[in-house]
Structures are given as C-alpha cells and as structure tokens.
Amino acid sequence: MAVTACQGLGFVVSLIGIAGIIAATCMDQWSTQDLYNNPVTAVFNYQGLWRSCVRESSGFTECRGYFTLLGLPAMLQAVRALMIVGIVLGAIGLLVSIFALKCIRIGSMEDSAKANMTLTSGIMFIVSGLCAIAGVSVFANMLVTNFWMSTANMYTGMGGMVQTVQTRYTFGAALFVGWVAGGLTLIGGVMMCIACRGLAPEETNYKAVSYHASGHSVAYKPGGFKASTGFGSNTKNKKIYDGGARTEDEVQSYPSKHDYV
C-alpha cells in the first residue's frame, strides 16, 4: 500500500512539476524591467524565451517574437534547449509512469516490468527536473551579469548633456515557476525511484511463492485470496486486484480458471 501511495504521489508531483516546466517555458516574463525606485512606469518591458513584450501604462501591450535563430545569444539558445529537453523527457517519463502505476492493470505485465518502468520514469523525471533547474539558473545568471553591467553603464558617461535611460532587467515570474516546477519534478522522480525499490522485493517474494507452488503447501481459498505457508515473511493473505497478470512459473504450475499473483 505504501509503495502504491509513494508511486502515485510521485506521479502526481511530477505531473504538476512538468506542467509547471511547460508553463514556465511558455511564459513571457522570464526577465522583467527593473523598476528600482520607481514602482510606476509609463513603459514596462519584459522578455521570455520566445518573444519580448512592452506594456504601456495606457494598457496597450505589444509582443514581438524572436524571428531569428542565428541572431540570438548562445545562452538563450542553450536555455531553450534545456527547457525543451526537460519537457520532452518529462512527457516521456509521464507516459512510461502511467503504465508503471501499480493501480493500473495492463494485460499480463509482470511486477518486475512495472518496477523497471517506475525506475525508468523516475530517472527521466530527475533528469527533466535538473534540465529545468539548470535552464532557469543559466538564465538567472545571465540576468545577474547583465544587470550589473547595465548598472555600471548607468553611472558612466553621464557627463554629457544627453543621457540614455538604460533598461535593466531583473528576475521574472517564470524563473520562480521554473525553479519550483523543476524541484517538484525532481522530487517526483526521487519518489518514483523509491517506489521502484519497494516494488522489487514484493516481486521477488511472489516469484518464490510461485516457484515452490508445485508442492502441497499452497492452499486455495474462496473469494480470490491465496494463502502461502512456510515461506518466510510472505505469510499474509493477499487480495487479487489484477485480473490477468501472472508469472511464467504460475502459468506452468497452475493451469487454473482463477488468476492469482
């Protein structure tokens, strides 16, 4: 039960995380104009991975896409790549984890297969989360560097009559969404990996039960329960939930009309 809960929770947390990564990637507010001591601005600039926007105090908002690939900074391209890799890995991980969920029955899939799939999806979620965190962190670092550079520029060359208003950019909402989402995906992946460790011993015990079942030590009980005697810790009755999954050993040993795990 704890394993199923851990697996299910890991899946849900990862799902929320990946949704957050997708949201962050699509958001326009990766960097926003630093308002420093002026909270009200006539023209407010903010930028995303795919386009930059300007919101006037009149309420008019205009966004322009980055229609060039070669003209964009390499760092921005790298961030885009990391976020896309994170989304792709996360999406594949979600797909794999759906089939790996203990509460879902798919044909005659073994628990060992489910354990492997759980581990695979867990690793995918971890890598996906790390990609998102890395992408957001690279962008944040780029912002910090540019911020101090433009701050330095603001206080140089002011001797002339004409001043240039230097637009400084600071962290946008998307960065925080990305960090949190990446963290959630990472936690979800770790939970899936923990769930996998919990799935593996159960599967081993069941194989042992099935393997030794050629003797008379296995009793059949009505109502879909199976009792096993004399096999270490596996002495509890287990309710059967999967209507058609059995191990190779069972198929050979019990050509029965009942399905047991």
């Epitope: 601005t41 023209v43 930059s52 300007v54 009149s58």
Partner: antibody, heavy 118, light 113 residues
C-alpha cells in the same frame, strides 16, 4: 462620441482648496487612465497626476505631491482633482485627459480656469 | 525629469510652404523593447485644449491630415507640415511619453507669413 466635460471656472483665495470634476461619456470609463494636466498663462503644459478609474490607483507628479488628490466616482463616470494650499502661481487652466496607445492623450476636457487671487 | 526643448519658439511660414518644428530631449525616448520612440505631438489653438497629432514619434492619429508627419529617434525629433494651411495656425507641443512625470516642450507658435 467620447466626451470629457469639466466643471466651471473657480476663483479661490490663497491657502484655499479647489476641486475640479471631469465627467466622462461615450466610452467605458473604467478602462482608461484619466490624467490631469494644467497650463498656467504663457507657460508650458504641466502633468499633475493620474488615476485608474477601475482600481483607483494613482500616481502624482512629485512637484504636487501632498497638495494634489485625484479621486473618482465610477457610478457617475467622473474623475476629480483637488488641489490644496493654493498659491497665486496655481492660477491656470486645468485639463483632464484620457490616456491611449503610445501614452498619448487622445481626448481632453474643455478646461477649467482656476484663478487664485487675494 | 526629462526636459524637452523646442525650436524655434515661433515660426512664420507662407501658405502652402513647409513648416518644420524641432524637439530635443534631455534623455533618449527610444524604448529598446519595441524600438519605439515615446514622443507625442499636439496642436493647440487659442481657447481650446490640445489636440493629438502624432504618437510614437511618427504614427499619425486617425483623422489627422497626412500633411502632418513626425520623424526622429532617440533625442532629436521633428514635426513637419508639408503644405501649410490657414487652419494650421496654432501652438505645437511635444510630449515625453516615456517616463513619469510626463513633460512637455515649451511650445512653438506657428503663424502665417
């Protein structure tokens, strides 16, 4: 047709306060920032402040801070500008103006002449 | 605050001739985000409120005759009336629409020669 109709001319004593109204019609009052601009005789136009009728949020020119208060009554589609501690140099024509794209003023009230004299 | 200086203070031009008014800003009015210049031009006739002519330095307001045009970028801007008409006699103002507080030029009085 968009219209901004302002209250009539006022004559005030130094130290007194004046409250000018601006009634909007022909558009959704709560959708546009309303600004106040004044023009003293022979002087350039001077921006005083603004209010967003929907939220009620305001922003004032530092020069007038503490003396000017801009309010609104959404039910009456009216904006108000109150200037206190009047001085002779506050004698001017006061305009309300609607802000549009490009942070420009596309519609203006007819103006309210405020004369400060002892 | 941004200071706008218009030149000349007054201008006399013959009917049908070209009139040019300049506006210089103490700071750049070019916004890097959308590459737009936040400078506006108004026309004010005696006893009337100002009338919007041009925003974003060169975008003509709807209903404004096409003889009015705006140009310039950064700190130097120009309002041009290609062929002066009698009804164009007025005072023209430029406005900083980029940062608060919004500021205006001192005005240029346009007359017929």
């Amino acid at each position: 047709e968009v219209q901004l109709v302002q209250s009539g001319a006022e004559v005030k004593k130094p130290g007194a306060s004046v409250k000018v109204s601006c009634k909007a019609s022909g558009y959704t009052f709560t959708s546009y920032w309303m600004h106040w601009v004044r023009q003293a005789p022979g002087q350039r136009l001077e921006w005083m402040g603004m209010i967003h009728p929907n939220s009620g949020s305001t922003n004032y020119n530092e020069k007038f801070k503490g003396r000017v208060t801009i309010t609104r009554d959404t039910s009456a589609s009216t904006a108000y500008m109150e200037l206190s501690s009047l001085r002779s140099e506050d004698t001017a024509v006061y305009y309300c103006a609607r802000l549009k794209t490009g942070n420009s003023f596309d519609y203006w009230g007819q103006g309210t002449t405020v004369t400060v004299s002892s | 605050d941004i200071v706008l200086t218009q030149s000349p203070d007054s201008l006399a031009v013959s009917l049908g001739e070209r009139a040019t008014i300049n506006c210089k800003s103490s700071q750049s009015l070019l916004n890097s985000g959308n590459q737009k210049n936040y400078l506006t031009w108004y026309q004010q006739k005696p006893g009337q409120p100002p009338k919007l002519l041009i925003y974003w330095a060169s975008t003509r307001e709807s209903g404004v005759p096409d003889r009015f045009s705006g140009s310039g970028s950064g700190t130097d801007f120009t309002l041009t009336i290609s062929s002066l008409q009698a009804e164009d006699v007025a005072v023209y103002y430029c406005q900083n629409a980029y940062t608060y507080p919004f500021t205006f030029g001192q005005g240029t009085k346009l007359e017929i020669k």
